[in-house]
C-alpha cells in the first residue's frame, strides 16, 4: 500500500544533499585551517538530526543547537557584512576584501547556502518531493528556521562599525520583512555595535539620485536609531567599479565618488 | 597527489586475526573521513567501515559488527582495521579509501588505494 505523502508548495530537498553539505564541511575545513578541529561527520549528524523525523512545520531554533555548537566559529566581530536582496553582489565584495565576513563565508552559512532540505514526521526520510514554503504552508520549516537561527547569531556577535548592502533596484530598498529586517536588525546589540552603515547599491548605469533619502531607508534609520546606534549610509553609483577599485585602491579612477 | 598505500593483508586462519594499515598522503587528513571497502572473489565492492576526520564517529556494515575495529591516527596519517575472529567469507581485497563521510550506509568516497589481499582459509 502506498504511504500518503504531504505535498508542499515549495521545492524538495535539494538533489545529493547529504553528499553535498559534507563534500562543502570537508572543502570549508581545509581552506580554513582555524576550523581543522571540525568533525565534519558529526556535522552532518547533527544537520540531520535537526530535521529528520521531525513534521517540516514543526522546527524549533532548539533543533539546530547541536549543529550550533559544532560550527562555533569566531570572525572579527568588526568585519561583518550584512546584505539584503543583493548576496551575489555581497559574496563577490568578500572575496575580493577577504578580511570581511558575509554569514555565508561562515562555516554553517557556507554549509546550508543555496540549498533546501526537509524531512517527514516519524520517518527517517529526507523529502526530496516537495518542502514547505514560508508563505504558503508554513514559516517554522527546517530552511527558514535554520538561517533565522545563524542570522540571529551571526548579527548577535558583530561590533563597532557594522556594514550592510541593500539593493537599490528594488521597490523596498530596506524590507522589514527580510532577514536582515525581521531578525538581524533587532539583534544588533547596541553596547557593541556603535554605527549601522548602510551601502545602497544602484543598477542602472545612468542612476544618479540619492537612494539614501529613500523612505525605507529613513524608516530602517528609525529604526536603527531607537535602538541606540547610529546610522549611516552611502550610495554606490557604479557596483562594478565599486568591486575593481575594492582590488585596485591604487587605480587612479578610484578617488572619484563610486 | 592523493596517494592512499595499504598493507597488513595475508593468509590467515579461520577465526585468526589481522591489522591493516593505510599510510596516506597528499590531503588534508583530518579533514576527510576514512574507509575500508571490500571486494571478495567474483562479487561486487562492499562497504565495510568508516571513521570520521577526527575519529569521533565510526560505522560498520552488519557482518562486521563486534569483529573489526576501525582507528585513525591523525598524526601518521594512518587509518587502520583490526580484524578480528576471521571467517571465510571475509576473504576479499581491502581497499583503504578516503572520502567526504557517509549517511547511513551510503559512503561518499573520494579515492582509493590499491589494495590488499586477505585469506581466510584453513
Known amino acids: 500500500v502506498p504511504r500518503w505523502r504531504q505535498q508542499w508548495s515549495g521545492p524538495g530537498t535539494t538533489k545529493r544533499f547529504p553528499e553535498t553539505v559534507l563534500a562543502r564541511c570537508v572543502k570549508y575545513t581545509e581552506i580554513h585551517p582555524e576550523m581543522r578541529h571540525v568533525d565534519c561527520q558529526s556535522v552532518w549528524d547533527a544537520f540531520k538530526g535537526a530535521f529528520i523525523s521531525k513534521h517540516p512545520c514543526n522546527i524549533t531554533e532548539e533543533d539546530y543547537q547541536p549543529l550550533m555548537k559544532l560550527g562555533t566559529q569566531t570572525v572579527p566581530c568588526n568585519k561583518i557584512l550584512l546584505w539584503s536582496r543583493i548576496k551575489d553582489l555581497a559574496h563577490q565584495f568578500t572575496q575580493v576584501q577577504r578580511d570581511m565576513f558575509t554569514l555565508e563565508d561562515t562555516l554553517l552559512g557556507y554549509l546550508a547556502d543555496d540549498l533546501t532540505w526537509c524531512g517527514e514526521f516519524n520517518t527517517s526520510k529526507i523529502n526530496y518531493q516537495s518542502c514547505p514554503d514560508w508563505r504558503k504552508d508554513c514559516s517554522n520549516n527546517p530552511v527558514s528556521v535554520f538561517w533565522k537561527t545563524v542570522s540571529r547569531r551571526f548579527a548577535e556577535a558583530a561590533c563597532d562599525v557594522v556594514h550592510v548592502m541593500l539593493n537599490g533596484s528594488r521597490s523596498k530598498i530596506f524590507d522589514k520583512n527580510s532577514t536582515f529586517g525581521s531578525v538581524e536588525v533587532h539583534n544588533l546589540q547596541p553596547e557593541k555595535v556603535q554605527t549601522l552603515e548602510a551601502w545602497v547599491i544602484h543598477g542602472g548605469r545612468e542612476d544618479s539620485r540619492d537612494l539614501c533619502q529613500d523612505p525605507t531607508i529613513k524608516e530602517l534609520e528609525s529604526i536603527i536609531s531607537k535602538r541606540n546606534i547610529q546610522f549611516s549610509c552611502k550610495n554606490i553609483y557604479r557596483p562594478d567599479k565599486f568591486l575593481q577599485c575594492v582590488k585596485n585602491p591604487e587605480d587612479s579612477s578610484c578617488t572619484s565618488e563610486i | 597527489e592523493v596517494q592512499l598505500l595499504e598493507s597488513g593483508g595475508g593468509l590467515v586462519q579461520p577465526g585468526g586475526s589481522l591489522r591493516l594499515s593505510c599510510a596516506a598522503s597528499?590531503?588534508?587528513?583530518?579533514?576527510?573521513?576514512m574507509s575500508w571497502v571490500r571486494q571478495a572473489p567474483g562479487k561486487g565492492l562492499e562497504w565495510v567501515s568508516a571513521?570520521?576526520?577526527?575519529?569521533?564517529?565510526?560505522n560498520y556494515v552488519d557482518s562486521v559488527k563486534g569483529r573489526f575495529i576501525i582507528s585513525r591516527d591523525n598524526s601518521k596519517n594512518t587509518p587502520d582495521l583490526q580484524m578480528n575472529s576471521l571467517r571465510a567469507d571475509d576473504t576479499a581485497v581491502y581497499y583503504c579509501?578516503?572520502?567526504?563521510?557517509?549517511?547511513?550506509?551510503?559512503?561518499?568516497?573520494?579515492?582509493r588505494g590499491q589494495g590488499t589481499l586477505v585469506t581466510v582459509s584453513s
Open positions: 597528499g590531503f588534508t587528513f583530518s579533514s576527510y573521513a
Open positions: 571513521i570520521s576526520g577526527s575519529g569521533g564517529s565510526t
Open positions: 579509501a578516503s572520502g567526504k563521510g557517509w549517511d547511513g550506509n551510503t559512503w561518499y568516497e573520494d579515492y
